[in-house]
């Protein structure tokens, strides 16, 4: 693995990184020293290779010469050839590998299994939440807060093809325009993806399987975040994916069909099934505003009910409000009718552990969570691990080139479409595109599918699994019919106009640059996948709903400085880039700012000390507080007394001056504290701060 | 067997109240409505309000409100009628009656009657 | 208030003869009228109730019929023990009305 992991792949010079870094450096390459560059004024400058404190942090990177930690690793064969195998070796090498192939099968089983029991208990755990968001038809016109609550919900039940049934369900019922559903449903898309980023957080043992998994799960984040960027406001001013989708509506008939196959289902329901079986109906009644079913649990006791339609008679406000004038009377008290109900009659519990136990949703949610979390990170353990095993030497060359080579010229371009697909098909055979690119995940990591590759299986699955919505809409029953289809069609759109937004123009392919970015981020500060997941996902969803909540005004009034100061960055990094003299000095560069600001070190500082705090039996919260403040406001040679007795044998000294206690250590601090603030990065020809500046 | 045992005859001076209990026996009370009907001497019958025994919910009939009260103990199985304000044209056979409630199957059982007879 | 006519107000009839007592409401009842009969020095007893179903333990010569607004109670052959007052009932909304009563005599 290369020093700078987050440096990797920034330029395609991998030597030119510092221009102007005053003083000696004690680890320039010999090979280096002496070499001469101009700067932007013209005065030659020593080429400098950099030190971990002068890392650069960017989202936007070109691939470098030499060692690249994207180049796909060479899974070499360490075992003896076939050639040198006696028969009996022979013989229990084929057993061997019969052996592992079943392994293999029952793991990847297990992973299916446990990522729909994940579903399950991230709905028992928000689904009720989750329909009550729902239920605010108000903010939902809102197209902002319809696309949060899309993103929240999708979350929240780890499904979006549940919440595209709930927003059917409105739909039909008239509870929600086509026009309102939109933004929700390319909130679902955006929700659906954050599972392979979980899936990819389960990779975080080697740094650049990491790094590769982390951003082959997020190029499908980035794909869908960029996509809403672009079409959420082109849709809310022309409303193009209604008007196409009624176009499309009314140019053919549409009559029921058959409902996609469950292949998947059909293998992985007879196990999850004794798991846990729930009542998706209810998150639906929820949305559509049943107060009852709020009490109600998700969990499914009874699995084999008989319906009776009975006559009952019920009390109405007033004769007027009879069903029929022959049925209608009075007791003196109450008037009375009488109604068609239809009773529901349990013949046979279901067959899961938790139909017995009186255990609130929430508890059972939690216990699933943890359980299949656990199941989730031990079968991606044994996967990659066998994986790693089977895929060596030959093996591995074939597999590799089969899924990663292009068609010979002038056919190339061609590969990236027969990928989607490829992923689409796919998708349509699993049923779900959670599913797929969950499995294509750990393939990422250990480098048998590249992020160019993957980048369209995952667009692929995106249509895959709208085809699916599509069919199981033509199998809708006839009320639902329309309105399903017609979400089901925005939905296929909406991805194919992300896909020609992303895809055919390499330069437009922004996604794999940005998940590698993140990736390289991800890779030397591993808490930052799961600040990104969480501010991502949850944070910023949540922010902009409690606004919406609070209105139109109050919405724009916070949104509008945040995203002008946002673009105002990037013109600013545009300018740093490209034309820096027209800058004045001061703005050529982040130094101006507070190094938190503009670095993840001293919140890396800030983390590593909070968690070797946690883990300590007793945590010195002064000295600790203390370090805080040094690294926060950029001093680096402070001194923090000890305030107490600690208890660790490394620390006896009775002062010590504040070291970084990140993941790497930083032999360049030292450094820093003499010539902080001198440090430049150049990166695409940007100039940007060091020390992994996220400008 | 259902019965409805109304209290005795009672002879009230104007101005003053009569309360007439009605005990039942012999059917769950509380799925029952109990209805108060009088007759006055040579008259028809004449509804004066029901009670849910249930739930205590009452209604009456627009020209006894206010002047009536129906309750109900449901330890006893017992129903009361208390009639205020009393005037001569109040004299009459007051009935409590029963109804199954949510049923449409009217006053299927009525009490003997208890006489009131309102004179100075 | 619903207001319920009853015809006649009496009548004298002979044992075995065939009774018809009417009753009309005011406005539209549906099939909510019942029919009570009340022996001299007795309390009411019900017969028919939903304008046409006999109370358990109802002699079936007394057949109720009608709907909406027009009903009558036939006593298809009258014994003696018939001798009473009956009144109709409609309970389509409160408050429960009755008609005024149809007296029954045997010559």
């Known amino acids: 693995m290369a020093p700078w992991p987050e440096l990797e792949n920034a330029h395609p010079n991998p030597n030119k990184f510092i221009e102007g870094a005053s003083g000696p450096q004690s680890s320039i390459p010999d090979k280096d020293k002496g070499t001469s560059k101009t700067n932007d004024s013209g005065t030659p400058v020593a080429k400098i290779e950099l030190l971990p404190s002068y890392s650069a942090l960017v989202l936007i990177e070109e691939p470098p010469e030499g060692n690249d930690p994207w180049d796909l690793p060479e899974l070499q064969d360490n075992g003896i050839k076939w050639s040198e195998r006696d028969s009996k070796g022979k013989i229990l090498c084929i057993f061997q590998g019969i052996g592992k192939f079943i392994l293999l099968l029952g793991f990847l089983y297990l992973f299916v299994c446990s990522l729909d029991v994940l579903s399950s208990a991230f709905q028992l755990v928000g689904g009720k939440m989750a329909g009550q968001f729902f239920s605010n038809n108000s903010i939902m016109s809102n197209p902002v807060a319809g696309l949060v609550i899309g993103v929240l919900v999708t979350v929240m039940v780890q499904s979006s093809s549940t919440s595209s049934s709930i927003i059917v369900s409105m739909v039909a019922s008239s509870l929600l325009s086509v026009r309102a559903a939109i933004p929700i449903i390319m909130g679902a898309n955006i929700g659906t993806s954050i599972t392979n980023t979980i899936v990819a957080l389960m990779q975080a043992g080697d740094r650049n399987e990491f790094r590769r998994a982390f951003a082959g799960a997020t190029v499908h984040d980035f794909f869908n975040w960029l996509s809403v960027l672009v079409l959420l406001p082109l849709e809310a001013a022309t409303h193009y994916l209604e008007k196409l989708t009624n176009l499309v509506l009314e140019t053919f008939s549409f009559q029921n069909g058959e409902d996609a196959p469950d292949i998947l289902k059909v293998i992985t329901d007879p196990f999850t099934k004794l798991i846990i079986q729930l009542d998706k109906k209810v998150i639906q009644q929820i949305a559509m505003g049943d107060s009852e079913a709020q009490n109600k649990s998700l969990i499914k006791i009874w699995c084999k009910t008989i319906s009776n339609v009975i006559e009952e008679n019920v009390t109405v406000p007033s004769p007027d409000n009879c069903t029929s004038p022959s049925y209608c009377w009075t007791d003196g008290i109450q008037t009375w009718t009488i109604q068609n109900v239809t009773e529901k009659e349990n013949i046979a519990k279901c067959q899961h552990i938790f139909v017995n136990f009186s255990l609130p949703d929430l508890a059972v949610g939690i216990i699933l969570l943890t359980v299949s979390l656990l199941i989730l990170c031990g079968c991606l353990i044994m996967i990659v691990k066998l994986l790693g095993s089977v895929l060596r030497g030959q093996v591995a060359t074939v597999i590799k080139k089969t899924l990663n080579t292009d068609f010979p010229f002038p056919f190339a371009w061609l590969t990236g479409y027969l990928a989607i697909l490829v992923g689409a098909g796919m998708t349509f055979i699993v049923q779900s595109s959670s599913v797929f690119t969950s499995a294509m995940t750990p393939l990422i990591g250990i480098g048998v599918i590249s992020i160019e590759r993957a980048y369209p299986l995952t667009l692929g699955s995106n249509i895959g699994t709208t085809t699916t919505a599509i069919l199981a809409a033509l199998a809708s029953p006839g009320n639902t019919l329309r309105s399903s289809l017609q979400i089901a069609l925005c939905h296929f759109f909406f991805n194919i106009s992300g896909i020609l937004l992303w895809y055919p123009i390499p330069f437009t392919r922004l996604p794999i640059r940005l998940a590698k970015g993140l990736g390289n981020i991800s890779a030397k500060y591993r808490w930052f996948a799961v600040f990104y997941l969480i501010f991502f996902f949850l944070l910023t969803p949540l922010t902009v709903f409690g606004l919406s909540l609070a209105g139109w005004p109050v919405l724009v009034g916070v949104g509008v400085p945040i995203i002008l100061l946002i673009l105002l960055v990037l013109c600013l990094r545009m300018l740093q880039a490209r034309c820096p003299r027209i800058l004045p000095l001061k703005l050529r560069d982040w130094n101006f700012l507070p190094l938190w600001m503009h670095s993840l070190k001293p919140w890396d500082n800030i983390i590593s000390l909070a968690t070797s705090c946690f883990q300590r039996r007793c945590c010195c919260c002064c000295r600790v507080c203390c370090r805080v403040c040094c690294m926060v406001c950029g001093c680096k040679c402070c001194r923090c007394s000890k305030c107490c007795k600690n208890l660790e044998e490394e620390e006896k000294e009775q002062d010590v001056p504040v070291k970084a206690s990140g993941g790497f250590d930083n032999t360049a601090m030292s450094k820093e504290c003499q010539d902080e603030g001198k440090g430049q990065v150049e990166v695409l020809g940007m100039k940007a701060l060091s020390n992994t500046t996220v400008f | 067997q259902v019965q409805l045992v109304q209290s005795g005859a009672e002879v009230k001076k104007p101005g003053s109240s009569v309360k007439v209990s009605c005990k039942t026996s012999?059917?769950?009370?509380?799925?029952?409505?109990i209805h108060w009907v009088r007759q006055a001497p040579g008259q028809g019958l004449e509804w004066i309000g029901g009670?849910?025994?249930?739930?205590?919910?009452?209604n009456y009939k627009q020209n006894f409100r206010g002047r009536v009260t129906l309750t109900a103990d449901k330890s006893t199985s017992t129903a009361y009628m208390e009639l205020s304000s009393l005037r001569s044209e109040d004299t009459a056979v007051y009935y409590c009656?029963?109804?199954?409630?949510?049923?449409?199957?009217?006053?299927?059982?009525w009490g003997q009657g208890t006489t009131v007879t309102v004179s100075s | 208030d619903i207001q319920v006519t009853q015809s006649p107000s009496s009548l004298s009839t002979s044992v075995g003869d065939r009774v018809t007592i009417t009753c009309t409401a005011s406005q539209d009842v549906g099939t909510a009228v019942a029919w009570y009969q009340q022996k001299p020095g007795k309390s009411p007893k019900l017969l028919i109730y939903w304008a046409s179903t006999r109370h358990t333990g109802v002699p079936e010569r007394f057949t109720g019929s009608g709907s909406g607004t027009d009903f009558t109670l036939t006593i298809s052959s009258v014994q003696p023990e018939d001798v009473a007052t009956y009144f109709c009932q409609q309970y389509r909304t409160s408050p429960l009305t009755f008609g005024v009563g149809t007296k029954v005599e045997i010559k």
């Open positions: 012999g059917f769950f009370f509380t799925e029952y409505i």
């Open positions: 009656a029963r109804w199954r409630n949510a049923y449409y199957s009217a006053m299927d059982s």
């Open positions: 009670i849910i025994p249930n739930n205590d919910v009452t």
